[in-house]
Interface confidence: low
Amino acid sequence: GITNINCSGHIWVEPATIFKMGMNISIYCQAAIKNCQPRKLHFYKNGIKERFQITRINKTTARLWYKNFLEPHASMYCTAECPKHFQETLICGKDISSGYPPDIPDEVTCVIYEYSGNMTCTWNAGKLTYIDTKYVVHVKSLETEEEQQYLTSSYINISTDSLQGGKKYLVWVQAANALGMEESKQLQIHLDDIVIPSAAVISRAETINATVPKTIIYWDSQTTIEKVSCEMRYKATTNQTWNVKEFDTNFTYVQQSEFYLEPNIKYVFQVRCQETGKRYWQPWSSLFFHKTPETVPQVTSKAFQHDTWNSGLTVASISTGHLTSDNRGDIG
């Protein structure tokens, strides 16, 4: 970067090289070039010469002033016009940064996704800081009082094997950068209460010919958790509002859920589960589309096959990919 150049003088920033976004700052340049009494001193920001707000302080020093500096990063350097030189001579350069101190991390959440072997802790970092901000996650056993610390730039995965201090812990997060440090409230967790069951997946759908046609949605999870509560939400693709059905589920077999739907309409389904009575939910599953038949033939559907639809007896639809879905309900 610009900081690695050989300097013939000195460049510095007041109040500091890293400063709060929106501040007024001064950049000073002092020449120390052999056999040169600078005629003029020039400042460059990101390679472009600055024309305004430059003040000559003395024979070797000048100041560039910025009001309300809002750029997260800039490379500054200054040059001198020396008599008898045909080009400007480089004096020195510096990378400057502006940003914000971290907000207090809030909404600290720790979950264990079944089979992952990790406890995943996340938090709301607050507003963007624009500068390098590190987070230290503190995990303290309430049984042994032993505390472990983990350094990260965003979220953290902590191996459950490393959580040797029993089942109950306090977790909190410290955020720090060059402009400040903040600490979250402490979250008390019990490892048995934060497990999120293995993902529930909708595999297929069929509409059965009956006096009142009914659609059966087939869905399953590999979870080993005995008591699981699930929600399936569904709506016509033209609607904004979801309908939600609740299920207390035992995943020893594939689940079959019945719906009485309007004919000749494309519907979308999603499912999510939680360990019964616990706080955290899975993310909603991938979007699963199914179009009901016009009259009463039996129809089967596959996940997001766009408009997979025949006028004949079946429309096959097997769950294959992953569509990013509205995860408003991820964990909460």
């Epitope: 709301n124 607050g126 939400r233 939600v244 939910w281 509205d326 408003r328 991820d330 964990i331 909460g332």
Partner: antibody, heavy 121, light 107 residues
């Protein structure tokens, strides 16, 4: 501490529009949804709509033609606008937070103190 | 829209007594019901959600029951600060709707 505070004009002339700002602290609008509710002696508590954490909105169908919500996550502000006010829109207007992420199923665990709006010429 | 019919509109009771308020939904709403308390000149405050779950910091003398279309809210051993207004709210479908309220008064 979680807090919501509404600021509004107090008095609005008939047929004019009403703008209210709800400024929040103690939580992030990127993670929580904010409802708008009004209360008048004649009609009791009426739900007007919600702005979801992702910025999408749902409005009470009775008001959909004259309501709009928006927000600025970085400033922690939610904006409410209602057009074509009539005297029977006189009410206390509240913003309120969903208590956690269950789509469409959230009670409102924190409310603003409310801003009283009178529609009169 | 789902209509929420709350009764009684007002009720008189004495300190230490129990009172029950009823809320009827015009169609089934599962257990998606909340109860709020409102003191004069203040905003509503959440007491019960999901029909039976007590919100954080709410005293255990408040309780909720019911599912489907009929719901009850009970205050056992009334304290002086409980003589205010109470509202039910369905969270099942848009638009969310509230009951007309019940005002508790000291006998």
């Amino acid at each position: 501490d979680v807090q919501l505070q509404e600021s509004g004009p107090g008095l609005v002339a008939p047929s004019q529009s009403l703008s209210i700002t709800c400024t929040v602290s103690g939580f992030s609008l990127t993670n929580y949804d904010v409802h708008w509710v009004r209360q008048s002696p004649g009609k009791g508590l009426e739900w007007l709509g919600v702005i979801w954490s992702d910025g999408s909105t749902d409005y009470n169908a009775a008001f959909i033609s004259r309501l709009s919500f928006s927000k600025d996550n970085s400033k922690r502000q939610v904006f409410f606008k209602m057009n074509s006010l009539q005297p029977d829109d006189t009410a206390i207007y509240y913003c309120a937070r969903n208590n956690y992420y269950r789509y469409g199923r959230n009670p409102m665990d924190y409310w603003g103190q409310g801003t009283t709006v009178t529609v009169s010429s | 829209d789902i209509q929420m019919t709350q009764s009684p509109a007002s009720q008189s009771a004495s300190l230490g007594e129990s009172v029950t308020i009823t809320c009827l939904a015009s169609q089934t709403i599962g257990s998606w019901l909340a109860w709020y308390q409102q003191k004069p000149g203040k905003s509503p405050q959440l007491l019960i959600y999901a029909a039976t779950s007590l919100a954080d910091g709410v005293p255990s003398r408040f309780s909720g029951s019911g599912s489907g279309t009929k719901f009850s809210f009970k205050i056992s051993s009334l304290q002086a600060e409980d003589f205010v207004s109470y509202y039910c709210q369905q969270l099942y479908s848009s638009p969310l709707t509230f009951g007309g309220g019940t005002k508790l008064e000291i006998k």
